[in-house]
């Protein structure tokens, strides 16, 4: 359960976080479970331990195999295993399956490839973007931060791409390759000013006092992968999140997509027990995306019980 | 939603032996660790120890050490707490308790709604 | 075993008011709980890790501190606040929970 699968290429820097997680405060302890000895923390050694860090600087083909991690809590001593496997470097372009990292999606208006791992390494920008080991080159490619960005994506894009970069320890420099796979969905989407279609501007809800009550507030943004778009509510122009009534919160509901394709989101307020002091509140539907803000108002009424004597 | 659901309150005598439930639901059960929590009349709150339902292995308060027993059943999501050799001053509300995500221990944010045990001959 | 000693043990405040509960620890530690505890319910965890807030917890409640001493403060005090606070740490096994301030209405 508490596994994972690492793998580097001989000679680059490969760091692996052990699968159990802790506090910063919690001793961390590094283990070769082949035979049980212990990893250890001088930064001298080519394979060290560094807290939830297992740093192979660089590494070699023989540092294959499964690692484990004690994380020693207050109570418990929790175990993880981390399964590493060191590939020889490849002569020719090609990158194998098993050096893989997850196939990402992209379209024309989302186009965003994460460099895998990096995170876990020192590292400084620009990063090095390769497809099909080809440098990228061209104002269509930029590089910003830890992810690729493409404009105006084509099919064509589509294919394997490796980030390069420059891992930092203690002055020396090791090199770190990642690579990933990239699909272009074939979608002519657009998007445009968000439409609110729940609730109506100004509308009034009738609510019952000590009942419970839910508002819908509901938007559509275009076709397609939306690169940018929520909907959300205030209360009297504050987040509700801020706004601090426990009894008031938002839940987001299922993505949209009607028939006609378009991409359109949920979010919906429940007010449970309403209270009096809830009526004279002021509930803002706002949906906004690269286009702008939409703002739908809404404001609570007492709903009076049907009398039956009348 | 993740639920703790303990046994119905319990008279005791001196000297007898008294096992409180704590049944899961809500989420996969041996993923967290359980922990019990006891609240005598009017007084504060005291740790009394932790069971891993994964592996059954537990970590006990020394003040309880020889008296407390946690044990597990994962094929109904249930922990049980059982507390020998009662006296008087074991009257109290036991409450189990989980963390809101097991590694961090970041704070029991998952309680029981209590399971009062009295005491009394 | 770590001992949490709180202070006051009684607070009384009117709605409106600030308050501020202190939680003294008798050896250092790296993080602070906070809980609201109601009479007849169980425990509420409000603030973890010193100052995070936990889930559903308005942003009147605020912890801080580090070491020896931490404090949880309330900016101000609503009819519902009125209840007994724990303070608890994580830092080493058993676990231990301070004595309560109980805030009460003045």
């Known amino acids: 359960k508490f596994s994972k699968q690492s793998w580097g290429l001989e000679n680059e820097a490969l760091i692996v976080r052990c699968p159990r997680q802790g506090k910063p405060s919690y001793t961390v302890d590094w283990y070769y479970s082949q035979t049980n000895k212990s990893i250890p923390t001088q930064e001298r050694n080519r394979v060290f331990a560094s807290g939830q860090l297992l740093k192979f600087l660089p590494a070699a083909v023989a540092d294959s195999g499964i690692y484990t991690c004690i994380v020693r809590s207050p109570t418990f001593n929790r175990t993880g295993y981390a399964n590493v496997t060191i590939y020889k470097k490849q002569s020719d372009c090609n990158v194998p399956d098993y050096l893989m990292y997850s196939t990402v999606s992209g379209s024309e208006k989302n186009s965003k490839i994460y460099c895998p791992t990096i995170d876990l390494y020192n590292w400084t920008a620009p990063l090095e973007w390769f497809k099909n080991c080809q440098a990228l080159q061209g104002s269509r490619y930029r590089a910003h931060k830890s992810f690729l960005v493409i404009d105006n994506v084509m099919t064509e894009d589509a294919g394997d791409y490796t980030c390069k970069f420059i891992h930092n320890e203690n002055g020396a420099n090791y090199s770190v390759t990642a690579t990933r796979s990239f699909t272009v969905k074939d979608e002519q989407g657009f998007s445009l000013f968000p439409v609110i279609g729940a609730p109506a501007q100004n509308e009034i809800k009738e609510v019952e006092i000590g009942k419970n009550a839910n508002l819908t507030c509901s938007a559509c943004f275009g076709k397609g992968t939306q690169f940018l778009a929520a909907v959300l509510w205030q209360l009297n122009g504050t987040k509700i999140t801020d706004f601090g009534e426990p009894r008031i919160q938002q839940e987001e509901g299922q993505n949209q997509s009607f028939s006609n394709g378009l991409a359109c989101l949920d979010m919906v307020l429940r007010i449970a027990d309403v209270k009096e002091e809830d009526l004279l509140l002021q509930y803002d539907c706002l949906a906004l995306n690269l286009h702008g803000l939409r703002r739908h108002t809404v404001r609570l009424s007492r709903k009076n019980p049907i009398d039956h004597h009348s | 939603q993740v639920q703790l659901v303990q046994s119905g309150a319990e008279v005791k005598k001196p000297g007898a032996s008294v096992k409180v439930s704590c049944k899961a639901s809500?989420?996969?059960?041996?993923?967290?660790?359980l922990h019990w929590v006891r609240q005598a009349p009017g007084q504060g709150l005291e740790w009394m120890g932790t069971i891993d339902p994964e592996t059954g292995d537990t970590v006990y308060n020394q003040k309880f050490k020889a008296r407390v027993t946690m044990t597990r059943d994962t094929s109904t999501s249930t922990v049980y707490m059982e507390l020998s050799s009662l006296r008087s001053e074991d009257t109290a509300v036991y409450y189990c308790?989980?963390?809101?995500?097991?590694?961090?221990?970041?704070?029991?944010?998952?309680w029981g709604q209590g399971t009062l045990v009295t005491v009394s001959s | 075993e770590i001992v949490l000693t709180q202070s006051p043990a009684t607070l009384s405040l009117s709605p409106g008011e600030r308050a501020t509960l202190s939680c003294s620890v008798s050896?250092?530690?790296?993080?602070m709980h906070w809980y609201q505890q109601k009479p007849g319910q169980a425990p509420r965890l409000l603030i973890y890790d010193t100052s995070k807030l936990a889930s559903g917890i308005p942003a009147r409640f605020s912890g801080s501190g580090s070491g020896t001493d931490f404090t949880l403060t309330i900016s101000s005090l609503e009819p519902e606040d009125f209840a007994v606070y724990y303070c608890?740490?994580?830092?080493?096994?058993?676990?231990?929970f301070g004595g309560g301030t109980k805030v009460e209405i003045k």
């Open positions: 608890q740490q994580w830092n080493s096994s058993p676990l231990t």
């Open positions: 308790a989980r963390a809101f995500y097991n590694d961090y221990d970041d704070g029991f944010a998952y």
């Open positions: 809500g989420y996969t059960f041996t993923d967290y660790e």
């Open positions: 050896s250092s530690v790296s993080y």
